[in-house]
């Protein structure tokens, strides 16, 4: 809106900052146990992994940055069950990795709930 | 604990993953208005900026990744006051940027609240 009032370089820097804040897959640290909804007696080592998740800003405050496509990355982790009855096992754990993001509006809630099986 | 059971390469990959998830300053997108606690008639363009904030995992569930040192980065943004009485003003906005992080125990909550002026 202010192209006539400010020098092009300043506007360019501001615009580049805005572009970098846009909704996109960003490297994020997720806790494996809470991600998988595991019981409290199952632990993972390391407890956290790095994956890409949607994040950032949208052009409208009422829009939410959400994933439109997901891949599942296999991470090699030690699964430990307590009490420890055997050697911690090295297991492949599949964690959701967001590959595509979009700023989406909220759809109106239905008066009834939808349960997906 | 499992060096005798698994090959060194696998353990190295797991360890590298763990190091990358550790509590550290990470580039994050923050919404300026909510960050500054501005009134609803003051807006910024762009509304979001990139700064570093503490994030990641700690070795114990009882610890939280918190900032131990902070610098303030000046971002050039347009400040827009509504109703619009003048041209949007280009202002330097100081946003907190975490430069140091540490896994700290959660402090017990005080029965009274602390207000910083």
């Amino acid at each position: 809106f202010a192209a006539t009032f400010y020098d092009i370089e300043t506007l360019k820097v501001i615009d580049e900052e805005w572009q970098r804040t846009q909704c996109s897959p960003r490297e994020t640290c997720v806790e494996v146990a809470s991600e998988l909804g595991k019981s409290t007696n199952t632990f993972f080592k390391p407890p956290c992994v790095n994956v890409f998740r949607c994040g950032g800003c949208c052009n409208e405050e009422s829009l939410i940055c959400m994933n439109t496509s997901t891949s599942y990355i296999s991470k090699q982790l030690f699964e430990i069950s307590v009490p420890l009855t055997s050697v911690p096992e090295l297991v492949p754990v599949k964690v959701a990795n967001h590959t595509g993001c979009k700023c989406l509006p909220t759809a109106p809630r239905h008066p009834y709930s939808i349960i997906r099986r | 604990f499992a060096a005798t059971f698994y090959d060194i390469e696998t353990l190295k990959v797991i360890d590298e993953e763990w190091q990358r998830t550790q509590c550290s300053p990470r580039e994050t997108c923050v919404e300026v208005a909510s960050e500054l606690g501005k009134s609803t008639n003051t807006f910024f363009k762009p509304p979001c900026v990139n700064v570093f904030r503490c994030g990641g995992c700690c070795n114990e569930e009882s610890l939280i990744c918190m900032n131990t040192s902070t610098s303030y980065i000046s971002k050039q943004l347009f400040e827009i006051s509504v109703p619009l009485t003048s041209v949007p003003e280009l202002v330097p906005v100081k946003v907190a940027n975490h430069t140091g992080c540490k896994c700290l125990p959660t402090a017990p909550r005080h029965p009274y609240s602390i207000i910083r002026r």
Partner: antibody, heavy 118, light 112 residues
Framework: QVQLVQSGAEVKQPGASVKVSCKAS????????MYWVRQAPGQGLEWMGY????????TYNQKFKGRVTMTTGTSTSTAYMKLRSLRSDDTAVYYC???????????WGRGTLVTVAS | DIVMTQTPLSSPVTLGQPASISCRSS???????????LHWLQQRPGQPPRLLIY???NRFSGVPDRFSGSGAGTDFTLKISRVEAEDVGVYYC?????????FGQGTKLEIK
């Protein structure tokens, strides 16, 4: 100052397509979503959908899905709305409007009258 | 879809007198982020619509302070404290909390 300049009036036959353009100036085109709204003669406003010029993402009103396509030309800061399989009840003034980050459509084009008649 | 119902559909007002338009939505317009995206537009004869009020009560640039908005949840009101000749036209409420974005059917403000 912000300006949205729309293309001129069109007369189309039923079954044909129309493409309306909206040239934006006075602001960073990719920083705001562009909405399309229509108004039939003597009627109220109807939201058709919007496009995010930054990445071309679109969200359409289900009512127009399959018939409407919204695109942008970022080099020319122009938004386009194409409506196919026109019917007589598509006769309306078609507006482009910029969506404010904080809500509402803050700047509007003057409108493009599309008349569908055989 | 969210249905926006305006009352009255027509409002004859004497110059200098107040006017009030009501807008009711079929579902709450409170967004998951806590904001309420209910806006008011004015359309003068032969003109495109113009934003008056956004997010329930915030006046847009250049809008006189005789216009004010209020309400919460599903019930909203636009008030004009003293009607002037230039206020003649159709007033629409609109919501941008949900998709599709929807408008009220419009309220025609005319001078008695």
């Amino acid at each position: 100052q912000v300006q949205l300049v729309q293309s001129g009036a069109e007369v189309k036959q039923p079954g044909a397509s129309v493409k309306v353009s909206c040239k934006a100036s006075g602001y960073t085109f990719t920083g705001y979503n562009m909405y399309w709204v229509r108004q039939a003669p003597g009627q109220g406003l109807e939201w058709m959908g919007y496009i995010d010029p930054y990445n071309g993402d679109t969200t359409y009103n289900q009512k127009f899905k399959g018939r409407v396509t919204m695109t942008t030309g970022t080099s020319t800061s122009t938004a386009y709305m194409k409506l196919r399989s026109l019917r007589s009840d598509d006769t309306a003034v078609y507006y482009c409007a910029r969506a404010s980050y904080y809500g509402g459509m803050d700047y509007w084009g003057r409108g493009t009258l599309v008349t569908v008649a055989s | 879809d969210i249905v926006m119902t305006q009352t009255p559909l027509s409002s004859p007002v004497t110059l200098g007198q107040p006017a009030s338009i009501s807008c009711r939505s079929s579902q709450s317009l409170v967004h998951s982020n806590g904001n309420t995206y209910l806006h008011w537009l004015q359309q003068r004869p032969g003109q495109p619509p113009r934003l008056l009020i956004y997010k329930v009560s915030n006046r847009f640039s250049g809008v006189p302070d005789r216009f004010s908005g209020s309400g919460a949840g599903t019930d909203f009101t636009l008030k004009i404290s003293r009607v002037e000749a230039e206020d003649v036209g159709v007033y629409y409420c609109s919501q941008s909390t949900h998709v599709p974005r929807t408008f009220g059917q419009g309220t025609k403000l005319e001078i008695k």
